[in-house]
Amino acid sequence: KVFGRCELAAAMKRHGLDNYRGYSLGNWVCAAKFESNFNTQATNRNTDGSTDYGILQINSRWWCNDGRTPGSRNLCNIPCSALLSSDITASVNCAKKIVSDGNGMNAWVAWRNRCKGTDVQAWIRGCRL
């Protein structure tokens, strides 16, 4: 599923991401824009053999199991396929683990490059939440 900006903002808010670990909702919507272009089925293979999955591009080396990444830790204890669902529950729950891991949202390169330090509230402006 490809979410609309405000549709995703509402879903993320429903799942408790607004101000989770101090990151406002705009940060999460901005991260999703530049990680997956709001597409829950986005996958990107990395040259180290791991793959990033879903709307927040969660990596199979650490966070989920795809059965083909050597030494996968599967810290979210889920199959990577769950991160591709149009229901973003699994992605959000795993993202909450990731953001609690010490580096905050810096774990997402696209967030660090494109969202950090910018007017992220713009990503939810005009949305009825």
């Epitope: 824009k33 990107n44 293979r45 990395n46 040259t47 696209a110 490059n113 910018t118 990503w123």
Partner: antibody
């Protein structure tokens, strides 16, 4: 087919400013980032900063901070780059370039034709 | 800022040759590496994104590999239209930075 068409060549005096435009056609303008990249004669490529037109907020490379302003006009699908306090080292071809997919890797899949800015007294 | 160093800075090759250009980052950039081709007086053209993914419409003789700090662009069989300058670009952190370029000339 996406096209980025830039304004024409400029000759400027040291200390002055230049504003280069980049008009997009044939695709979605607002939700794709536009970056500005310059290339001095015979040299490599240097990224200056970027903007996402739908929100109008720009971010700049530290090197150009305070001297460059990137803006966008959604109504005309045009992005602008203004560089002030020009010096001879700013003589370069200035390109606008659009984000490609996947956004996360920040490739540039469409480029303007380039605008030569010459700074000379 | 992340420094990108390409080698060689120039090379001479013949049509049909296999050509390899390397790009080294001053720190690990995972797979956040893109390659461009530029011909004189023209804008750069995207060839490879994410270190190894071929951009749509680019001939399959171009390929990319590498991860972390060391990356390679390979042209399996050089064609007349491939004589140009090639640049790598990292997108792991801002400012985005490019290698200094590798000029591929006719031997």
């Amino acid at each position: 087919q996406v096209q980025l068409v830039q304004s024409g060549a400029e000759v400027k005096k040291p200390g002055s400013s230049v504003k280069v435009s980049c008009k997009a056609s044939g695709g979605t303008f607002s939700s794709y980032g536009i970056s500005w990249v310059r290339q001095a004669p015979g040299q490599g490529l240097e990224w200056m900063g970027w903007i996402i037109p739908i929100f109008g907020t720009a971010n700049y490379a530290q090197k150009f901070q305070g001297r460059v302003t990137i803006t966008a006009d959604e109504s005309t699908s045009t992005a602008y780059m203004e560089l002030s306090s020009l010096r001879s080292e700013d003589t370069a071809v200035y390109y606008c370039a659009r984000d490609g997919n996947p956004f996360r890797y920040w490739p540039f899949d469409y480029w303007g034709q380039g605008t030569l800015v010459t700074v000379s007294s | 800022d992340i420094q990108m160093t390409q080698s060689p800075s120039s090379l001479s090759a013949s049509v049909g040759d296999r050509v390899t250009i390397t790009c080294r980052a001053s720190q690990s950039i995972s797979s956040y590496l893109n390659w461009y081709q530029q011909k004189p007086g023209k804008a750069p053209k995207l060839l490879i994104y994410a270190a190894s993914s071929l951009q749509s419409g680019v001939p399959s003789r171009f390929s990319g590999s590498g991860s972390g700090t060391d990356f390679t662009l390979t042209i399996s069989s050089l064609q007349p239209e491939d004589f140009a300058t090639y640049y790598c670009q990292q997108s792991y952190s801002t400012p985005l930075t490019f290698g200094q370029g590798t000029k591929v000339e006719i031997k």
